[in-house]
């Protein structure tokens, strides 16, 4: 056959289902490849063919829409599975064509079994709530365009095993949960099930979230060095190893860059002849707040090094802050021990 | 579609057990709940406890705990419920009825369990 | 466990006629109500599910409607093949429970 733009096998588009629900999958050629929509493509003559190979497999082979019910059937550029089976799993490939054009992508399709609470190998989108912040809401994801809007699902939330009733502070509302006030005990997986008939027949939808309560904007401040700090001094002597901790808190701010960096007389460590190592360790708290360690090392320490200027810098999208190390050179202790031990007669 | 198929009636002495099969066809086995209800002769419906197939949980209602066991053999796509200690009251019209979520959206037709000496 | 009273335990009607059920918990069970329907000797058939969705297949002058601890099925014309037993079952917490039942006959 003539030569096809074959885009490769699109990894970045795991798409995962569960076992026995419904699941649209549409063809990624006009999502991610294409400068075209299947509209136009339809109307330029261009006809997309599917064909999938199953898991373990190397032959390609076409899918079989003639199955009882119309398990699996095409429309536009989707393809419908109602209901997905377990050796649905494989690589799917959508083609578009004409005599004189060919383009295609596969896409792997994982189809995955859920235990009685609702885990599974689905990978789970993480959606975060501010704490204390007044009234949020989680909707139930990646549920349109499976029924019309005539048709009333019903929905039941579930939060880990068990259905979301009489909870303080969350309120299923449809397909949305409302939290009133989330707090740290609010942290979890939440499932959404959504019902609904079709052609005599009863589907299910399941959606996975997982909730994380992070800090609010209300409370977030510019970041804080609590080292280095005024009341501790560096005092070393020529041939020690200096270490000088620079410990900086950032309050959760979302989709911000935290950052810290030393400058050794106002320059970046990488640009001075020094023989600096920075090691760096970050760790979390509950609400994603965060603090960032950067340990500054200079292994045999020079009388010039410790005349220097050591600084801390840090940024959020708060703002920046600098903090100078304070460094010092130790001076010689008078060696009493001589004439203290003459002094007590000592011979 | 969706079929569940149950073994046929059972005369029982008391005292004696009593499994009754509930053969699942149509849609996958081990991702819906299945429940067992009973009905003796001229009275409502009784939930005994269900049981999750793919993993095996199961929650009994305190009434049959102890007495009742509800297994799942996943390869065969059939339920089992085993009552034990059979009484005369215990003389009823036994259900399988499978649900995705908690609601019993298909039934399988009956076995009548008959305990009498 | 949560009892489920219903109301009439039986009731007599003419083809064409509006027919109501009741059920009352003993607790609110936050909409989690279901219906079936039995007939003579057969299993019982899933109605409406989260007290007003109806499943799928059922005719649609069944209708659910309630909050709370009152719930309502509403056969809108009653039909000759709707004599049956209805029964109302709550699925808020375990153990699930079962009113128990109503008989629909026609006049």
């Known amino acids: 056959s003539e030569r096809c733009d074959d885009w490769g096998l699109d990894t970045m588009r795991q798409i995962q289902v569960f076992e026995d629900e419904p699941a649209r999958i549409k063809c990624p050629l006009f999502e991610h490849f294409l400068k075209f929509n299947y509209s136009t493509a339809h109307s330029a003559g261009l006809t997309l063919i599917w064909y999938w190979t199953r898991q373990d497999r190397d032959l390609e082979e076409p899918i079989n829409f003639r199955l009882p019910e119309n398990r699996i059937s095409k429309e536009k550029d989707v393809l419908w599975f109602r209901p997905t089976l377990l050796n649905d799993t494989g690589n799917y490939t959508c083609m578009l064509r004409n005599t004189t054009y060919c383009s295609k992508v596969a896409f792997p399709l994982e189809v995955v079994q859920k235990d009685s609470c609702f885990n599974s190998p689905m990978k789970l989108p993480v959606h975060k709530l501010y704490i204390e912040y007044g009234i949020q809401r989680i909707t139930c994801p990646n549920v349109d365009g499976y029924f019309p809007s005539s048709v009333k699902p019903t929905i039941t939330w579930y939060m880990g095993c068990y259905k979301i009733q009489n909870f303080n502070n969350v309120i299923p509302e449809g397909m949305n949960l409302s939290f009133l006030i989330a707090l740290i005990s609010n942290n979890g997986n939440y499932t959404c099930v959504v019902t609904y008939p079709e052609n005599g027949r009863t589907f299910h939808l399941t959606r996975t979230l997982t909730v994380k309560v992070v800090g609010s904007p209300k409370n977030a401040v510019p970041p804080v060095i609590h080292s280095p700090n005024d009341h501790v001094v560096y005092e070393k002597e020529p041939g020690e190893e200096l270490l000088i901790p620079c410990t900086v808190y950032f309050s959760f701010l979302m989709d911000s860059r935290n950052e810290v960096w030393w400058t050794i007389d106002g320059k970046k460590p990488d640009d001075i002849t020094i023989d600096v190592t920075i090691n760096e360790s970050i760790s979390h708290s509950r609400t994603e707040d965060e603090t960032r360690t950067q340990i500054l090392s200079i292994k045999k320490v020079t009388s010039e090094d410790l005349k220097r200027s050591y600084v801390c810098h840090a940024r959020s999208a708060k703002g920046e802050v600098a903090k100078a190390a304070k460094v010092k050179q130790k001076v010689p202790a008078p060696r009493y021990t001589v004439e203290l031990a003459c002094g007590f007669g000592a011979t | 579609q969706v079929q569940l198929v149950q073994s046929g009636a059972e005369v029982k002495k008391p005292g004696s057990s009593v499994k009754v099969s509930c053969k699942a066809s149509g849609y996958a086995f081990t991702s819906s709940w299945m429940n067992w209800v009973r009905q003796a002769p001229g009275q409502g419906l009784e939930w005994m406890g269900r049981?999750?197939?793919?993993?095996?949980?199961?929650h009994y209602a305190q009434k049959f705990q102890g007495r009742v066991t509800l297994t799942a053999d996943k390869s065969t796509s059939t339920a089992y419920m085993e009552l034990s200690s059979l009484r005369s009251e215990d003389t009823a019209v036994y259900y399988c009825g499978e649900g995705y979520l908690d609601p019993m959206d298909y039934w399988g037709q009956g076995t009548l369990v008959t305990v009498s000496s | 466990d949560i009892q489920m009273t219903q109301s009439p335990s039986s009731l007599s009607a003419s083809v064409g006629d509006r027919v109501t059920i009741t059920c009352q918990a003993s607790q609110g069970i936050n909409n989690y109500l279901n219906w079936y329907q039995q007939k003579p000797g057969k299993a019982p058939k899933l109605l409406i599910h989260y007290t007003s969705g109806l499943h799928a297949g059922v005719p649609s002058r069944f209708s659910g409607s309630g909050s709370g601890t009152d719930f309502t099925l509403t056969i809108s014309s009653l039909e000759p093949e709707d004599v049956a037993t209805y029964y109302c079952q709550q699925y808020s917490i375990l153990p699930w429970t079962f009113g128990g039942g109503t008989k629909v006959e026609i006049k």
């Open positions: 049981i999750y197939p793919g993993d095996g949980n199961t």
